[in-house]
Amino acid sequence: RKIPKVGHTFFQKPESCPPVPEGSMKLDTGIINENQRVSMSRNIESRSTSPWNYTVTWDPNRYPSEVVQAQCKHLGCINAQGKEDISMNSVPIQQETLVLRRKHQGCSVSFQLEKVLVTVGCTCVTPVVHHVQ
Amino acid sequence: RKIPKVGHTFFQKPESCPPVPEGSMKLDTGIINENQRVSMSRNIESRSTSPWNYTVTWDPNRYPSEVVQAQCKHLGCINAQGKEDISMNSVPIQQETLVLRRKHQGCSVSFQLEKVLVTVGCTCVTPVVHHVQ
């Protein structure tokens, strides 16, 4: 899923208020819902008919520092006999997400949002039939 | 996938620098990679063996204002005959993502990151067999 562009009004104050200095805003350091629990079904990446692996990328100047990317293991999908069936296709499911980028210039530290495309997992699809010309 | 807690050092300046006022930081208003293109396989939500629907939630004080959640359509998976097979399970693939929350207090506007749990799509898995005792 794609994140739309940020509207030019999102960072502005209400019309009745004095304008904000161009280019930067106040970011509170706490994170809302930081402790929320994620409950994912167990080991779905290996139990899926379109299984995937994970690769971790690390960047200390990004929050979250760790971004995990999935890669589909197969071209096809795993059938009931545990064999790859290329009459079906494993395809990635992707999500645009936001991360927070930390920028240093000497003792000046600022932050900026960054869009990152994350492959979250894979699903098994019926291929679109292409008739040979 | 779960986003870890933000480290207490992430918002701090280097040790040799004067400390930052507690609680808020400078957020640049531009977004890095705002124009990147997302290419998702075509209509995978309806062609998947574990198909899903989308529901959109809208909040004008959040960026992105629109957050799309997937819901698996079936308990089982769709077989080659187009019928639901409950010997397999459709399960959601979830991803913790960050959004930016806008907070008003009169003419004072500040921003805060918020964790949101997004269901991105569904995948078909072999169920875990529970033996009756």
């Epitope: 990317q69 890669q71 990635p92 | 396989s41």
Partner: nanobody, 123 residues
Framework: DVQLVESGGGLVQPGGSLRLSCAAS????????VGWFRQAPGKEREFIGA????????YYAVSEKGRFTISRDNSKNTLYLQMNSLRPEDTAVYYC????????????????WGQGTLVTVSS
């Protein structure tokens, strides 16, 4: 977007070997199925084979099985085609291609293509 640039083509003698590379730029190379096609002079573009995002699943067109080996290195964003026991009939422009779905790639309907690299097998 994904940009693909092939390299490694050239003139080789019959019975010789060649390794083609395809460098991809783009943030999520590992989420793509990638593969190779070739087009001989005056002929249709022909599918050679493809490899899954993780590199664990490889599919070859029957005619090329054994002589050609496809591999990928996601840490380098690169796809490879190792060609052995080359014959004059292998002379063609070789194209690297990428898509998120094997079904599209296999039938030449990929979203992304390189510009091709020429391989000439001749004594």
């Amino acid at each position: 977007d994904v940009q693909l640039v092939e390299s490694g083509g050239g003139l080789v003698q019959p019975g010789g070997s060649l390794r083609l590379s395809c460098a991809a730029s783009g943030r999520t190379f590992s989420s793509y199925v990638v593969g190779w096609f070739r087009q001989a002079p005056g002929k249709e573009r022909e599918f050679i084979g493809a490899i899954s995002g993780s590199g664990e699943s490889i599919y070859y067109a029957v005619s090329e099985k054994g002589r050609f080996t496809i591999s990928r290195d996601n840490s380098k964003n690169t796809l490879y085609l190792q060609m052995n026991s080359l014959r004059p009939e292998d002379t063609a422009v070789y194209y690297c291609t990428a898509d998120q779905e094997f079904g599209y790639l296999r039938f030449g309907r990929s979203e992304y293509w390189g510009q091709g690299t020429l391989v000439t097998v001749s004594s």
